[in-house]
């Protein structure tokens, strides 16, 4: 992979060891927490990135109506499971054998059981909503600049191919970008929309993921893009299976 | 096969508008982008701009807004690139681009367009 | 804008020698991408992402660098090398070239 040979690093994921001891002599990065190989000329999993985080010491840390279906990550931080891939593995436990079944970005869509729950597959998140409001500003951005720069960032910062973007919608200060990427469209090394998200909001955050480059400087034609707040909205395939007590709640 | 076929030269006068069109083949050409560079002769390139060919979104270079619009035609897979006001200075020869998740991966033959009086 | 600027404009050389292109840009990039453009032609893409060969480029192609300061190097000139290279950026609108190098045989 193309891990900068001259000083042996990861581009696209800080939370890794590099050392010069592929074949060849090629730089190698494993990533922090699980030890697997990382390709550094693209984005790392979304799994293998929370649990890197988790390793680490923990200083270290016109719009749409989302569906019914629509799931928010309220689960917050957990040490997940990853298969050899990468993948987060449809059955999540933790250390007190609660379990729960989570998609295709590790996000909880049943509810928690014992250790005889059952997730029998891996289900793909195939529609992102990211929902941002952004700081007050003289006037209203020009909607086709936004909506370019938004596409371009992704495209450049995140290598999420343009047909992934299926939307950018914009009614001052919200922001909302539709990620859309069913099983069939997406390729081998196509970048997975679970990851360029998972990417995105940490670079709003400032918590760039990113070896060696700045952190996220978004502006619209010169005009600073500040965002103040972020929701991320996660549409499974398959709808996810709750209770109505949590329904309700 | 990848391809981006221009269309032929154009001669026109200062004030005239110039339309190139951009005809593409071998890809799924609503999943990409089109991007327009200019190049005068003996000199370098230069971005104009660049149409999502999906949405229609499109970011023009300051420079050139105002004076330049780009749109494109699922039915025939055609991208379209039209400067107006043209002046001297536009005498050159127009690229048009495929991006993805590079910036320009194919390229058109170009289309020379010469602006004299 | 981000400006880059290639040095030298122009290199005369002979073929086997081994060549450096430079290219500084006026603030930090995340990439550069190199395309090489002969007489008459459209620009080809050359090395993308810094460091990586486009497909079907021979491999005595090589980029590096990273933040300002990036350099194209082509270990031993072949007669086809022989014509004008340019870098680029898309880290930020507008897309922005650099000026070009032409290589001439000596």
């Known amino acids: 992979h193309t891990a900068a040979q001259d000083n042996c690093t990861c581009p696209t994921n800080k939370m890794t060891v590099c050392s010069p001891d592929g074949p060849g002599g090629r730089c190698q990065c494993r990533a922090l927490g699980s030890g697997m190989a990382v390709d550094c000329s693209t984005l790392t999993s979304k799994c293998l990135l929370l649990k890197a985080r988790m390793s680490a010491p923990k200083n270290a840390r016109t719009l749409v109506r989302p569906s019914e279906h629509a799931l928010v990550d309220n689960d917050g931080l957990y040490d997940p499971d990853c298969d050899p891939e990468g993948r987060f593995k449809a059955r999540q436990c933790n250390q007190t054998s609660v379990c729960w079944c989570v998609n295709s970005v590790g996000v909880r869509r049943t509810d928690k059981g014992d250790l005889s729950l059952r997730c029998d597959e891996l289900v793909r998140t195939h529609h992102i909503l990211i929902d941002l409001r952004h700081r007050p500003t003289a006037g209203a951005f020009n909607h086709s600049d936004l909506d370019a720069e938004l596409r371009r960032l992704f495209r450049e910062r995140y290598r999420l191919h343009p047909k992934f973007v299926a939307a950018v919608h914009y009614e001052q200060p919200t922001i909302q970008i539709e990620l859309r990427q069913n099983t069939s469209q997406k390729a081998a090394g196509d970048v997975d929309i679970g990851d360029a998200a998972y990417y995105f909001e940490r670079d709003i955050k400032g918590e760039s993921l990113f070896q060696g480059r700045g952190g996220l400087d978004l502006r619209v034609r010169g005009e600073p893009l500040q965002v103040e707040r972020t929701l991320i909205y996660y549409l499974d395939e398959i709808p996810p299976k709750f209770s109505m007590k949590r329904l309700t709640a | 096969e990848v391809q981006l076929v221009q269309s032929g030269p154009e001669v026109k006068k200062p004030g005239a508008s110039v339309k190139v069109s951009c005809k593409a083949s071998?890809?799924?050409?609503?999943?990409?982008?089109i991007g327009w560079v200019r190049q005068a002769p003996g000199q370098g390139l230069e971005w104009i701009g660049e149409i999502y060919l999906g949405s229609g979104t499109i970011y023009y270079a300051e420079k050139f807004k105002g004076r330049v619009t780009m749109t494109a035609d699922t039915s025939t897979s055609t991208a379209y690139m039209e400067l107006s006001s043209l002046r001297s200075e536009d005498t050159a020869v127009y690229y048009c681009a495929r991006g993805s998740i590079f910036p320009f991966d194919y390229w058109g033959q170009g289309t020379l367009v010469t602006v004299s009086s | 804008d981000i400006q880059l600027t290639q040095s030298p404009s122009s290199l005369s050389a002979s073929v086997g020698d081994r060549v450096t292109i430079t290219c500084r840009a006026s603030?930090?990039?995340?990439?550069m991408y190199w395309y090489q453009q002969k007489p008459g032609k459209a620009p080809k893409l050359l090395i993308y992402d810094t460091s990586t060969l486009a497909s079907g480029v021979p491999s005595r192609f090589s980029g590096s660098g990273s933040g300002t300061d990036f350099t194209l190097t082509i270990s031993s000139l072949q007669p086809e090398d022989f014509a004008t290279y340019y870098c680029?950026?898309?880290?930020?609108?507008?897309?922005?070239f650099g000026q070009g190098t032409k290589l001439e045989i000596k």
């Open positions: 603030s930090s990039v995340s990439y």
């Open positions: 071998g890809f799924t050409f609503t999943d990409y982008v």
């Open positions: 680029q950026q898309w880290s930020s609108y507008p897309y922005t």
